[in-house]
Amino acid sequence: MMTGTIETTGNISAEKGGSIILQCHLSSTTAQVTQVNWEQQDQLLAICNADLGWHISPSFKDRVAPGPGLGLTLQSLTVNDTGEYFCIYHTYPDGTYTGRIFLEVLESSVAEHGARFQIP
């Protein structure tokens, strides 16, 4: 049985041109994390591999930075960056845990961070 839970930064908003940190945290499991994939819809943004470290997809190299930790920093945000982001934890022996973050990129300066929430 998969006992772990993923806590994410939840629904967040940020200003166009700014940057944002996407964070997930896996807890309540003894499973060992071997890789974390970051995806936007069906597009792979980055991989953090337990042995090989970070790999950023070439098409996102200019605007995506690894970290902090297993998180991901998106820079030079555009309105087109609005949408769902997923952190996918590959763990032994539990399997995969997936966390969801919704990012809204706003034109104005009224962007505020949403509350944290948990996905079991």
Epitope: V33, Q35, A50, P93
Partner: antibody, heavy 122, light 106 residues
Amino acid sequence: QVQLVQSGSELKKPGASVKVSCKASGYTFTSYPMNWVRQAPGQGLEWMGWINTNTGNPTYAQGFTGRFVFSLDTSVSTAYLQISSLKAEDTAVYYCARVGGFTVPEYAFDIWGQGTTVTVSS
Amino acid sequence: DIRLTQSPSFLSASVGDRVTITCRASQGISSYLAWYQQKPGKAPKLLIYAASTLQSGVPSRFSGSGSGTEFTLTISSLQPEDFATYYCGQVMRYPAFGGGTKVEIK
């Protein structure tokens, strides 16, 4: 090259303890989970459990709780299996086995130690 | 817990024969199955993972197929060095092995 080298054969009396070592080389020890597998004489493979090489947290399969202890010394890239209060039925070959692959579909025991024979006899 | 049942337990075959071994899981395990070869006095060796992916260095006469609950290991043309015991294994949740199939010389 990537390998796991286990300690040598042991002959023990019932009630004694034994500690089997499994030294890893050729890879980053803390990046890959480590498992222990038992094979009794003439029998098949039996999964004993595993240890998280990042945290040192052990997980034991049913039938391997109490007398069996998994531990690590990451400074020398070594995993250990200790069995206490040995019984005749503990006579077996004990293997350490690394979980290879980084994504779930790829997981498998890709590297195995050569095995350590533990014989329990009075 | 997931149980793996292998058949047959014993198999007699000749060099050049095509050999098929079956592994059934007590519940669906997607493609999370591996096959191992073990020779007497030696440690098991990984042949195939993810049901059908050949491990590096393993001869192409070995192949795997299946998904869900039924899997097969096929040796297209048995060679003298292939006489051994073969195990299926799964490593999700509670890892387990099948009972083994001993491939003997006919």
